[in-house]
Structures are given as structure tokens and as C-alpha cells.
């Protein structure tokens, strides 16, 4: 015998109080599949969460985070604060990068400046809290007797510290 509730489409529920009639989901609730005996309460995006997609009778609301925060967890269950460039998020909030490290993003950790000398190169541009150093040609390439035909080796890509 077929379950009469299986005929109830998404956006409705099988109402046992009304002889298993398919009733529309009440306001602020939804059912995303057919044959449901109850509708689920819509997620409310409050506080630091903001609504990315409104709830409908067939799908839940979707939240993201207000400016200054970014989503974490499945379905943006948490909002984590952004930091400024030149900072990293610690357990006690945003802190400036220590000397010799940098972060060019609003997320993530401070990373060590590239050590140009490991590749036999010189520092062309000093690093800052926000930017990696830029490595220049090796000192040998700058000597008067060096061939002017051989171009200097490309600098290490910024943001990649040596392993």
C-alpha cells in the first residue's frame, strides 16, 4: 500500500491532524524534499550574519558574514574576523606581524620573508609587514666583469619562503 504522504511535494508537509492532507509549510519554514511529515524552521541570519539567500517554502535561508568577517564551517556556521594586511589572527585577536615576517592578505598567518642569500641573490627591495622582500640579481651578476648578455635569474615569487 502506497504511503499517501509520498505524494506531498517539497514546500508542503503531510498533515496527520488533517487526514494526511498535504499542507503548505507555515511562514518561516520549509521542506526541501517531498513526503515530509514536518517542515523545518528557516535559519535566521542575525547579528554578524547577514542573509545571502532568503528562505523559501522549498529551501532554507543561506547566510554569509558582514564586512570585516569571513565564513567558517559548513554552510557558514561561524563568522571569523578579518585582520588587516600586515597582521595575523591569534587567539587574542589581530596582531601585527613580527619583524622578518609578512602577510599580504586579510586571513592566514604571517610568513617569513624570503631569504635571498639562499639563492645567492641580493635584496632588491626590503620586506615589510605587508610585503615579502624582492630578490635582485646575485652580486656576481652586478660585478663589472660580468657578461651583459646573460639576464639575471628570475626572483623567487613573493610569498613563498624557502622550505
Amino acid at each position: 500500500l502506497q504511503d499517501p504522504c509520498s505524494n506531498c511535494p517539497a514546500g508542503t508537509f503531510c498533515d496527520n491532524n488533517r487526514n494526511q492532507i498535504c499542507s503548505p509549510c507555515p511562514p518561516n519554514s520549509f521542506s526541501s524534499a517531498g513526503g515530509q511529515r514536518t517542515c523545518d524552521i528557516c535559519r535566521q541570519c542575525k547579528g554578524v550574519f547577514r542573509t545571502r539567500k532568503e528562505c523559501s517554502s522549498t529551501s532554507n535561508a543561506e547566510c554569509d558574514c558582514t564586512p570585516g568577517f569571513h565564513c567558517l564551517g559548513a554552510g557558514c556556521s561561524m563568522c571569523e574576523q578579518d585582520c588587516k594586511q600586515g597582521q595575523e589572527l591569534t587567539k587574542k585577536g589581530c596582531k601585527d606581524c613580527c619583524f622578518g615576517t609578512f602577510n599580504d592578505q586579510k586571513r592566514g598567518i604571517c610568513r617569513p620573508w624570503t631569504n635571498c642569500s639562499l639563492d645567492g641573490k641580493s635584496v632588491l627591495v626590503n620586506g615589510t609587514k605587508e610585503r615579502d622582500v624582492v630578490c635582485g640579481p646575485s652580486p656576481a651578476d652586478l660585478s663589472p666583469g660580468a657578461s651583459s648578455v646573460t639576464p639575471p635569474a628570475p626572483a623567487r615569487e613573493p610569498g613563498h619562503s624557502p622550505q
Partner: nanobody, 124 residues
Framework: EVQLLESGGGLVQPGGSLRLSCAAS????????MTWVRQPPEKGLEWVSS????????FYADSVKGRFTISRDNSKNTLYLQMNSLRAEDTAVYYC?????????????????WGQGTTVTVSS
Amino acid sequence: EVQLLESGGGLVQPGGSLRLSCAASGFTFSGYAMTWVRQPPEKGLEWVSSISGSGNNTFYADSVKGRFTISRDNSKNTLYLQMNSLRAEDTAVYYCAKEGTTETDDYHYNMDVWGQGTTVTVSS
């Protein structure tokens, strides 16, 4: 699959107590530090407390020091947070999180897996 499942939240009056639990599975529990964080209604995530893999080292945010106690039972793969003298400002969704290393501190933000959270409401 690494999973963390919190429980123990609820409604409590100011001055009351609650004990949160976090059941872990899918990884060698004793090999990793664990952390509690919380998200108050109008704010971003706040770090609450961390404990090393062995349970020997614990760290607390200033706002909960002396009131909250973090502990773990490695034989049961469970993390705990005993919360006493609760205040209205402790109202939040509480999440347990796995850190990426065995040791921990009160600085490095090193969480890589999160639970789904349990709600704590402190109100009279």
C-alpha cells in the same frame, strides 16, 4: 572522517553552571590539542580555552579565567568545558575545535576542524 560533536548547552540563570562535552572521532584524539571557541550573538568568534594533547597544559581567555575549566578524557575521546559563575555575556554558541599540533598556547590560531556548536543562554 574527523568529527566533533558538542553537547551540554542550554538555558541557565546568571551565577549558574553548565558542563559542555565534545565527543571526537576519526583521529587519534590524544595526539592533538583541543580548543573551545564561542560566537556571541552579535560578534565574531572568540577564543575561550585550549588544552594540550596530554592534558598537562591549559590556557584561558582573560574573560573566563577562574570561572571555566577545560579538561579532557583521552580514554573516552572527549573534551569538556566546566563553566561556573556564568554571566549574561557568556551567552553564545560554543564550538570545540581540533588544533593541528599536540602542544598549544594562548597565541597561535591553529584550529583545523570544528564541531557544529551547542548554544548556551545565560538569562534570568
